[in-house]
Interface confidence: low
């Protein structure tokens, strides 16, 4: 970087700014009485080329003119776009030890003339805003380029503003700082952009517009909503707008929704009634404005108003189910369960449930309120009982839902037939069945109920259930279904006053069990051996166990073992075998089988039968 040109000057012809592809001549001249002392003839002027402050070339071979010891002219060609620095240095050839001394320097800029600006677009934000225009400048010029935006209009209105582009900033937008008022609505305005740099100038085509073409109203502000008589479905949306607005667009949606409800409102004057809102729902409201029915532009959307509509009393029917358990000869425990209403039915925060148990003939009534979704009571085993549940929020209660308490599996003739459970994928099971063959009364509905077959599941966990219409014979169960867990699935057929059920086990995905059953004892009774075992721990079963296998072989024998396969029953933990020879020592073990395969063997036990075998 040359800062002080004490020793001489550097000039460039035709100019320090040249078009791409042009050549330039750089002349370096020493001032009088400057140069190598005593030996002017030993003055050697050299020219160095720098790009991005890096020396890239010594132009010694490009000399086209030389006044020995006084001045030299160099021709430079093939300069790349942008800025190139040339530094002239004095080399005193009689003193090789001293480095060349800087004389002066010049920066040559290579660029192109500006293209005519295109795609001019002007806007005025709001009635009190100012006109701002933007344009496309075209190709980069690599030079400082000045842009002038000129506007002309009625009554000799003229206005202009300037900005420039360079390697640090881009000029493609200018705010004229003038306001067009609505009284000029029909007037036409013309804007033009002129670009100029050291290599030329160009002008855009004139761009014509009217007030309505360019004025974008400010978005509405101060948005609020008033709910009529605290209604959850009707509200009046209010807002502030600029004075000239004639058309509004409203959009609103529940916060978790993906699609907007759209409304157009003409001459709304900052007010609009909405009648289709969902109670107790978080909504987002936005409004946009326009100054003219047919022309002009819409404003940006306003800031969102987010609010929750008020509550209304619950609607809909609770889904109720129950379990009956005899306690002793004259008492039974009834456990009622119900599913929460979905938000569109609850229409508010459910504060409590009203539960009623009523004996139909004797008019005995038990009533209570609970905040839970289950309720348990002990009642007499005699009589016909009915239960009802309703949900209450701050605005009221839903209509009670009734269910008759019947003996759910009491009528064999109502038991569904050919119940099957098939794995559909990792998290659901397809249950199918056939209707009861000889039902006394019509099936009103089916209930498919399921729970995990794990210790304590009946007391710890509420059941899961699905209500199925009487003409359907299948259900896809997915709620709380996990892979590698066996579920007990019951299909109940309910008539008005009776119930029948069938049971099956099923899983959504299975593997072979991790381990086999553990043989705990082998006992000999009446010429038969009884094998007793403990079941595989629940987490190691990995699905529904279909069979147990008992293997035995003579100790030290290399023959294949014999086996006995037993249908799995949860309640069974012993089994007799009767084909073993007396006074022969046997080794016995067990495995478990799921639909995916057989487990490794459990523990081995040795036993030598004493009695007479069959």
């Amino acid at each position: 970087n040359i800062d002080v040109c004490k020793l001489g000057t550097v000039t460039v012809q035709p100019a320090p700014v040249i078009p791409l592809g042009s050549a330039a001549n750089i002349s370096c001249s020493l001032n009088p009485k400057q140069g190598c002392s005593h030996y002017p003839s030993s003055n050697e002027l050299i020219l160095l080329k720098f790009v991005n402050d890096v020396l890239v070339e010594n132009l010694h071979g490009k000399k086209v003119h030389d006044h020995t010891g006084h001045s030299s002219t160099f021709q430079v060609t093939n300069l790349s776009l942008g800025m190139t620095l040339f530094v002239c240095k004095l080399n005193c050839s009689n003193s090789q030890k001293k480095p060349p001394v800087p004389v002066c320097g010049v920066e040559i800029s290579v660029g192109v003339a500006p293209e005519p600006p295109q795609n001019i677009s002007c806007v005025q934000e709001g009635e009190n805003g100012t006109v701002a225009c933007s344009w496309n400048s075209g190709k980069v010029t690599y030079l400082k380029t000045n842009y002038t935006l000129q506007l002309s209009g009625p009554n000799n209105l003229t206005c202009q503003k300037q900005c420039f582009s360079d390697n640090r900033q881009n000029c493609n937008r200018l705010d004229l700082g003038i306001n067009l008022s609505p009284d000029l609505a029909e007037s036409r305005f013309i804007v033009r952009v002129t670009a100029i740099n050291d290599l030329g100038n160009s002008s855009s085509l004139p761009h014509t517009f009217t007030f309505l073409d360019i004025v974008i109203p400010l978005p509405p502000w101060d948005i609020r909503i008033n709910f009529l008589n605290a209604s959850g479905s009707r509200g009046t949306l209010q807002w502030e707008d600029e004075g000239q607005v004639v058309l509004n667009q409203l959009r609103y949606q529940p916060l978790n929704s993906t699609s907007w409800n759209m409304v157009n409102a003409t001459n709304a004057k900052g007010k609009y009634d909405l009648r289709d809102l969902r109670p107790f729902t978080e909504y987002e409201f936005q409004i946009s404005s326009k100054l003219h029915l047919s022309g002009g532009s819409w404003s940006n959307w306003s800031e969102s108003l987010r609010t929750r509509t008020p509550e209304e009393e619950p609607v809909g029917i609770l889904d109720i189910w129950y379990m009956k358990q005899d306690i002793d000869y004259d008492r039974q425990q009834i456990s009622l369960f119900w599913k929460s209403l979905n938000p569109s039915e609850a229409r508010g925060k459910i504060l409590h449930y009203q539960v009623t148990l009523q004996e139909v003939t004797k008019k005995t009534t038990l009533q209570n309120t609970t905040r839970h979704t289950s309720w348990t009571r002990v009642i007499p085993r005699t009589g016909a009982w009915t239960a009802s549940v309703s949900a209450a929020n701050s605005k009221g209660a839903s209509a009670p839902t009734h269910i008759n308490i019947v003996d759910l599996c009491g009528t064999g003739l109502l038991a569904p037939h050919q119940v099957s459970a098939k794995s559909e994928n990792m998290d659901n099971i397809l249950v199918t069945w056939q209707p009861p063959k000889k039902a006394d009364s019509a099936v009103r509905e089916y209930i498919v109920e399921w729970r995990a077959l794990q210790p304590g599941s009946i007391t710890k966990f509420p059941p899961h259930w699905l209500r199925i219409p009487p003409d359907n014979m299948s259900a896809l169960i997915s709620e709380n279904i996990k892979p590698y867990i066996c579920y007990e699935i019951r299909v109940h057929a309910l008539s008005e006053s009776q119930g029948g059920c069938s049971s099956i086990r099923g899983d959504s995905k299975h593997k072979a069990p991790v381990s086999g059953p553990h043989i705990t004892a082998i006992t000999e009774k009446k010429e038969r051996l009884f094998i007793s075992w403990t079941h595989i721990p629940f987490p190691e079963q990995r699905g529904c166990i279909l069979h147990y296998r008992i293997y035995w072989k003579e100790r030290d024998s290399t023959a294949q073992p014999e086996l006995c396969e037993i249908q799995y029953r949860r309640s069974q933990n012993s089994h007799p075998i009767s084909s073993l020879q007396p006074r022969v020592t046997y080794v016995l073990w067990m495995t478990a089988v799921t639909a995916a395969g057989e487990s490794p063997q459990g523990n081995e036990r040795e036993f030598c039968p004493q009695g007479k075998a069959n």
Epitope: I2, D3, C5, P16, M83, G105, E107, K144, N167, R168
Partner: nanobody, 119 residues
């Protein structure tokens, strides 16, 4: 005609920072190349740092590289010299200078501001 006015000089302890400002008036600042020079007692005036009209190119004397930063704010019509890790040999009168283009000699000079580095 361009007038240059420096400010920000003063007494500072060794290792401390100082920020000089230069505000030109009289013509469009954004087309001027700017520089800071200094002159210590009994020594010649020397260039400290320069910056092109766009701010795209800067130059620093070897003695200040890594410690001093030259910058400009075309919107505020001001050039700055941020001086960090000052040393006693930085003591001098600091001058702001300007020229019409990014080459040639400096045409406009300020009156200077004294910077003294001493404990």
């Amino acid at each position: 005609q361009v007038q240059l006015q420096e400010s920000g000089g003063g007494l500072v302890q060794p290792g401390g920072p100082l920020r000089l400002s230069c505000a030109p008036s009289g013509r469009t600042f954004s087309t001027l190349a700017m520089a800071w020079f200094r002159q210590a007692p009994g020594k010649e005036r020397e260039v400290v740092a320069t910056i092109s009209w766009s701010g795209g190119r800067t130059y620093y004397a070897d003695s200040v590289k890594g410690r001093f930063t030259i910058s400009r704010d075309n919107a505020k019509n001001t050039a700055f010299l941020q001086m960090n890790s000052l040393r006693p040999d930085d003591t001098a009168v600091y001058y702001c200078a300007a020229r019409e283009s990014d080459y040639g000699s400096y045409d406009y000079w300020g009156q200077g501001t004294q910077v003294t580095v001493s404990s």
